[in-house]
């Protein structure tokens, strides 16, 4: 038994539509059944929960309804992302992956992604 | 802010049963991990239980497998540890810590002492 | 279980010298380390999480290195309320451990 890694990527661009899509995957040292997975924002020394899911293996990840983040999962990989962006969401988004039953319990928290939100230019007035 | 107010510890006979409670306020109960750590007088840190984000997500020392069992009540806010068959090394202040959003324990009560004695 | 051992036991040192502390681990916790400071009658505080990141509220006197197996608490500039005793735990699995704690106290 070993401690947990988690890879994601270093830096992401969000679409013009406020999106951001990245993959955060884990390299899992136990057998788990039961796998949640959380994202959160680090802004300065804070760090706030954006959303979280728990899915059993094989299954389909499920977010609440008003969550703002959407996600898949296939074998040790999620597929997350994150709506509704604008720039002063721009921050460094954190994979955190916990294996939670059967027991033992795993922690597994990845370095983060930064994601980059521009808002789009105002589409300019036309004369007619 | 945070705040973890354990109560419910005492002197009690060994072989007898004992309920420890751990109110919380300041955050929101439901979105954290839970646990309780003991420390024997004059002794070091011991990990006891964890009980997750749900009821039935739960994790004991071996010391406390069997005897002990965590749980807790969202809608009060508040953590439990049933002990029972408690012996005389049991004797420890029994504090309560909030899994922190990064894994570590983020926020303690001040704890509450429980003797086990004859 | 991952076994942490913490040296040394007793570190007596003056206000305002420097504090090293060592935690091992009996196999590889990555970055899942954390340092606590406890003080007589007094529940344990964070210092340290992530081996290096200093917990909320907490003075750039305390840092953390390490990784792996290996792990140092140092304190820069010893001050009076510094004197207390200092927990490692590894929280990447469980079960959660803790060290058994090193003392510092004045010389």
């Known amino acids: 038994c070993k401690a947990m890694h988690v890879a994601q990527p270093a830096v992401v661009l969000a679409s013009s539509r406020g999106i951001a899509s990245f993959v955060c995957e884990y390299a899992s040292p136990g057998k788990a059944t039961e796998v949640r997975v959380t994202v959160l924002r680090q802004a300065d020394s804070q760090v706030t929960e954006v959303c979280a899911a728990t899915y059993m293996m094989g299954n389909e990840l499920t977010f609440l309804d008003d969550s703002i983040c959407t996600g898949t999962s296939s074998g040790n990989q999620v597929n997350l992302t994150i709506q509704g962006l604008r720039a002063m969401d721009t921050g460094l988004y954190i994979c955190k992956v916990e294996l939670m039953y059967p027991p033992p319990y795993y922690l597994g928290i990845g370095n983060g992604t930064q994601i980059y939100v521009i808002d789009p230019e105002p589409c300019p007035d036309s004369d007619f | 802010q945070v705040q973890l107010v354990e109560s419910g510890g005492g002197v009690v006979e060994p072989g007898r049963s004992l309920r420890l409670s751990c109110a919380a306020s300041?955050?929101?109960?439901?979105?954290?991990?839970m646990h309780w750590v003991r420390q024997a007088p004059g002794k070091g840190l011991e990990w006891v239980a964890v009980?997750?984000?749900?009821?039935?997500?739960?994790d004991y020392a071996d010391s406390a497998k069997g005897r002990f069992t965590i749980s807790r009540d969202n809608s009060k806010n508040t953590l439990y540890l049933q002990m029972n068959s408690l012996r005389a090394e049991d004797t420890a202040v029994y504090y309560c810590?909030?899994?922190?959003?990064?894994?570590?324990?983020?926020?303690w009560g001040q704890g509450t002492l429980v003797t086990v004695s004859s | 279980e991952i076994v942490l051992t913490q040296s040394p036991g007793t570190l007596s040192l003056s206000p305002g010298e420097r504090a090293t502390l060592s935690c091992r681990a009996s196999q590889s916790v990555t970055s899942y380390l954390a340092w606590y400071q406890q003080k007589p009658g007094q529940a344990p505080r964070p210092l340290i999480y992530g081996v290096s990141s200093r917990a909320t509220g907490i003075p750039d006197r305390f840092s953390g290195s390490g990784s792996g197996t290996d792990f140092t608490l140092t304190i820069s500039r010893l001050e009076p309320e510094d004197f207390a005793v200092y927990y490692c735990q590894q929280y990447g699995m469980s079960p959660f451990t803790f060290g058994p704690g090193t003392k510092v106290d004045i010389k």
């Open positions: 810590a909030r899994a922190g959003l990064l894994g570590y324990f983020d926020y």
């Open positions: 009980i997750w984000y749900k009821t039935s997500e739960k």
């Open positions: 300041g955050f929101t109960f439901s979105s954290y991990g």
